[in-house]
């Protein structure tokens, strides 16, 4: 496999990870796919320090992160354990609100204008943040 030793152009390095901050919006799944095609994932927040870093870069704008409960329990896209991990929900969130009239509840997490988290309809076109780790072997698959 190959290792990424420095961040791509237009990405920001922080604590051995690279971050890319969108300036336009996409639905959660489309943002996730964008990150994956860039060998990254939607940002996974593992500490208060990382929360503050991301919050500083996105400003007071709704922004998708790599956390969802589309299949039941809340899960981080990179497999980081949700139950024991860092959380920064707004009071009374997540609430899986059905009152928006768009069908279904709310299955995708985003940073709100104050940085705290809310669950919302995954189809909303919010900005997003991609993250990829430095020094992580990419484990290229064998050719068939």
């Amino acid at each position: 496999g190959s290792e990424r030793t420095c961040c791509p152009v237009n990405w920001v390095e922080h604590e051995r990870s690279c971050y890319w901050f969108s300036r336009s919006g996409k639905a959660w799944a489309d943002a996730d796919n964008y990150c994956r095609l860039e060998d990254a994932h939607l940002v996974v927040v593992t500490s208060w320090e990382e929360q503050k870093f991301v919050q500083h870069h996105i400003g007071p704008v709704n922004t998708w992160m790599g956390l969802h409960d589309q299949n039941g329990p809340w899960k981080w896209v990179d497999g980081t354990d949700y139950e024991t991990g860092f959380k920064n929900w707004r009071p009374e969130q997540p609430d899986d609100w059905y009152g928006h009239g768009l069908g279904g509840g709310e299955d995708c997490a985003h940073f709100t204008d104050d940085g705290r988290w809310n669950d919302d309809v995954c189809q909303r076109p919010y900005r997003w943040v991609c993250e990829t780790e430095l020094d992580k072997a990419s484990q290229e698959p064998p050719l068939l």
């Epitope: 496999g1 190959s2 639905a27 964008y34 095609l37 860039e38 060998d39 076109p125 990419s138």
Partner: antibody, heavy 121, light 107 residues
Framework: EVQLLESGGGLVQPGGSLRLSCAAS????????MTWVRQAPGKGLEWVSA????????FYADSVKGRFTISRDNSENTLYLQMNSLRAEDTAVYYC??????????????WGQGTLVTVSS | DIQMTQSPSSVSASVGDRVTITCRAS??????LAWFQQKPGKAPKLLIY???SLQNGVPSRFSGSGSGTDFTLTISSLQPEDFATYYC?????????FGPGTKVDIK
């Protein structure tokens, strides 16, 4: 100068297999996502598949899912499309293209010259 | 999947004419739209990305506009080398679908 050169096309019977190659030069291949697009004779363009720079993540059109496999060899600067269980409707010119991430999406530029795949008995 | 439509399907024009091609998406794609030019027997060439950004090396007579569901490609003064087929493509979500194409030929 970026160059993409497809090969491996030809005549194959329905149900048969074929592997297309796309040799890349003029850019750091491993750092770019790549894609395949096809065009049936006299018809429009159809996106087929895409793959991330490392080869870890791949995406497919429903019409080819489960039959086609995209892969890449970054040591050889080559993109592949393994096509199995071929059907008459897979007959097309197959183009590879570099997928450049700009402004929050992926844009296909440049493209190779294409290789013709004909599925017929 | 997002459906893309184009109009007209063909247009006959003369050198120096202003030509406008429209593309419509079946749902909101923001500005995630590209325009390609294809000549017979050749590969497509990217002209415009992100709805209005001109690709490097593409003449300034080409311009793109629009957002949401309705988009336009304009050739301000048609040149002999511009007779070709033009395709729009959405890159909002997989699958990245193309429009059916608009053929620009000589009147």
């Amino acid at each position: 100068e970026v160059q993409l050169l497809e090969s491996g096309g030809g005549l194959v019977q329905p149900g048969g297999s074929l592997r297309l190659s796309c040799a890349a030069s003029g850019f750091t291949f491993r750092t770019y996502a790549m894609t395949w697009v096809r065009q049936a004779p006299g018809k429009g363009l159809e996106w087929v598949s895409a793959i991330s720079g490392s080869g870890v993540n791949s995406f497919y059109a429903d019409s080819v899912k489960g039959r086609f496999t995209i892969s890449r060899d970054n040591s050889e600067n080559t993109l592949y499309l393994q096509m199995n269980s071929l059907r008459a409707e897979d007959t097309a010119v197959y183009y590879c293209a570099k997928a450049r991430a700009v402004a929050g999406s992926h844009w296909f530029d440049p493209w190779g010259q294409g290789t013709l795949v004909t599925v017929s008995s | 999947d997002i459906q893309m439509t184009q109009s007209p399907s063909s247009v006959s024009a003369s050198v120096g004419d202003r030509v406008t091609i429209t593309c419509r998406a079946s749902q909101d794609i923001s500005s995630w739209l590209a325009w390609f030019q294809q000549k017979p027997g050749k590969a497509p060439k990217l002209l415009i990305y992100a709805a209005s950004s001109l690709q490097n090396g593409v003449p300034s007579r080409f311009s793109g506009s629009g957002s949401g569901t309705d988009f336009t490609l304009t050739i301000s003064s048609l040149q002999p080398e511009d007779f070709a087929t033009y395709y729009c493509q959405q890159t909002n979500s997989f699958p990245f679908t193309f429009g059916p194409g608009t053929k620009v030929d000589i009147k």
